[in-house]
Interface confidence: medium
Amino acid sequence: DSEEDEEHTIITDTELPPLKLMHSFCAFKADDGPCKAIMKRFFFNIFTRQCEEFIYGGCEGNQNRFESLEECKKMCTRDNANRIIKTTLQQEKPDFCFLEEDPGICRGYITRYFYNNQTKQCERFKYGGCLGNMNNFETLEECKNICED
């Protein structure tokens, strides 16, 4: 399963490459929501390019919200340290690309796309509309961008 190297310009202290997000929700602003609980959560800050702590109110908000720093990093950061050291980067697929197609337990039958590790391609499947896993994309394009070579 060989992957092509992706070219990157050399990064200096004053120059950062264009930010490539794994998920569009990583670009959402931290949203504490309208409720008044005090819950420690983490979000990806597109300006600092790091996962940071914020206080979540306990309801609503958005998907840029993680229970742990590790989960935030896994979902929203690529290995920027490697980018600084190397001019080329062997880009790895996120772990969830290797999860099996998962329709969940509901009966909604929504068309979604998943990465099929057998065929090494993104394919259409019917999602039930709830639960399931992260190998689940609204568009073929998004699936290809994230999971295909």
């Epitope: 908000g61 998907q63 509901c106």
Partner: antibody
Amino acid sequence: EVQLVESGGGLVQPGGSLRLSCAASGFTFSSYAMSWVRQAPGKGLEWVSAISGSGGSTYYADSVKGRFTISRDNSKNTLYLQMNSLRAEDTAVYYCANNGAAAAWDYWGQGTLVTVSS
Amino acid sequence: QSVLTQPPSLSGAPGQRVTISCTGSSSNLGADYDVQWYQQLPGTAPKLLIFGNNNRPSGVPDRFSGSRSGTSASLAITGLQAEDEANYYCQSYDRSLSGSMVFGGGTKLTVL
């Protein structure tokens, strides 16, 4: 007639473990996702965990993630919930239910009481 | 605090019409997820009353009906009867990051 019968509840100390079972009959067990839903004394309903018909996919509420494990044996028409590191707040009646139409639970068992107390 | 909000209690006289509300947010009912309603008689397991917003399983009287609009849903009971005295729960799915099946806190319906 669809029947779901839970067993395995009882009194356990904080930090202890219990394994609940749910024996199913009257429907094609392997064709249905199954869930555990609990109800603390005098409180409302709380979804705990779910498992797909094949057993290949499992799902958990945040409150039990890492402590509870759902599984099923389709050859025995039985659903299980292994509960570890139990806490006082896990005290509840635990119901098993089958996922039918939409996101609904069509049929429920009679429940089994789990009490976590020292 | 439940993800879906219901009035804790309601009451009505026999023969009356009562409506139980269920208010959610943009990540559950407002995201077009179906709502279900369950009836729990004292000392018994919950029973499915309405699924997919407004569908009744066989055996449920047509006195019970459901609807959903935006971030709210409601259960209407017409021709209230003594045996309708129970707790009623709405339930849906919430797509927030750790998505899960969610319930309302329940409404205790008393038939006067």
